[in-house]
Interface confidence: medium
């Protein structure tokens, strides 16, 4: 089928970085400056993304791939393609419509981004609090009093607290 299609459609022979130019007898023409085609057989090239304002260029546009942006210092990416930037706050804070606000008692944020989240409830796992939580750090759960027999030294780290890394794709 692919072979038949390529015989019928000359555009299928145009590689990435080119487009099938209807104005020139369907010749494969290179993408113009500031445009790209990431797949073959395209009839147009896409305009390159521009990293302006709070965005900065992480990867330059090429004839076969779009530019990638990240955010200037003091800001971090939002969204799967870093299509948005958001102001950083300090650890122990979260960004609200009124600006950066300290985490309420019983919640924490160990990053400059994201939201304040409740401390781990050690008692749900039958554990006791070994290290108290703060605005910046979750509690550390330790063994329950009944577990404190000679030789017992297990300390349970809290569930993953950090938001996963957001690297623009």
């Amino acid at each position: 089928f692919e072979r038949t299609r390529s015989l019928q459609d000359p555009c299928s022979n145009c590689p990435a970085g080119t487009f099938c130019d209807n104005n020139r007898n369907q010749i494969c023409s290179p993408c113009p400056p500031n445009s790209f085609s990431s797949a073959g057989g395209q009839r147009t090239c896409d305009i390159c993304r521009q990293c302006k304002g709070v965005f900065r260029t992480r990867k330059e546009c090429s004839s076969t791939s779009n530019a990638e942006c990240d955010c200037t210092p003091g800001f971090h990416c939002l969204g799967a393609g870093c299509s948005m930037c958001e102001q950083d706050c300090k650890q122990g804070q979260e960004l609200t419509k009124k600006g950066c606000k300290d985490c309420c008692f019983g919640t924490f944020n160990d990053q400059k981004r994201g939201i304040c989240r409740p401390w781990t409830n050690c008692s749900l796992d039958g554990k006791s609090v070994l290290v108290n939580g703060t605005k910046e750090r979750d509690v550390v759960c330790g063994p329950s009093p009944a577990d404190l027999s000679p030789g017992a030294s297990s300390v349970t780290p809290p569930a993953p607290a950090r938001e996963p890394g957001h690297s623009p794709q």
């Epitope: 939002l78 969204g79 799967a80 393609g81 299509s83 948005m84 958001e86 609200t96 419509k97 009124k98 981004r113 994201g114 939201i115 989240r117 569930a159 993953p160 938001e163 996963p164 890394g165 957001h166 690297s167 794709q169």
Partner: antibody, heavy 123, light 108 residues
Amino acid sequence: EVQLVESGGGLVQPGRSLRLSCAASGFTFGDYAMHWVRQAPGKGLEWVSGISWNSGSIGYADSVKGRFTISRDNAKNSLYLQMNSLRAEDTALYYCATGLGGWLRIDDAFDIWGQGTMVTVSS
Amino acid sequence: SYELTQPPSVSVSPGQTARITCSGDALPKQYAYWYQQKPGQAPVLVIYKDSERPSGIPERFSGSSSGTTVTLTISGVQAEDEADYYCQSADSSGTYQVFGGGTKLTVL
């Protein structure tokens, strides 16, 4: 290319069940909260459910609480919605969408959307 | 239950400015987001956090906030801007995500 593709919709009788899937590609799926949003024919958008990156936080709209279950498999880059005890008012186009970050936050926006899968509940 | 109120329709001539409002009691506290939806297509986020524009969204789209009302403004409206527009936010306690009823923008 960042992409979400929903599947699993169809015609189902009231009271029956259906499971929707959403396949993600082009981004690190496990880094983002995911949501289901629905749109009844000719109507507006309604948030249905959301799940944080690590499945540690889950939320539902009152209209589906106790009947729908959201889940995800980061190894398979997939999001799911198990819909039980379906009603006529659940008839809608169901979209999956990414949140802005990993945690489920009530002021989240919906960044990347799929094209939707249609669920029709009728006898 | 918490509601966001939008006008059902707004009409404007090409090149003019369209303004679509969204009202809700919690908007002084909660951010608003705006989506554009064309027939048969999925919604697209055009404004986030009241007034910020995602990369790739034309500069003619802007957002503003004043008290209990947020406004989406489209300057120099083009035919391709004809679509349904939805605002989205949360209630004051941060319990519910809510969409407005949508506004159909007609370009005359």
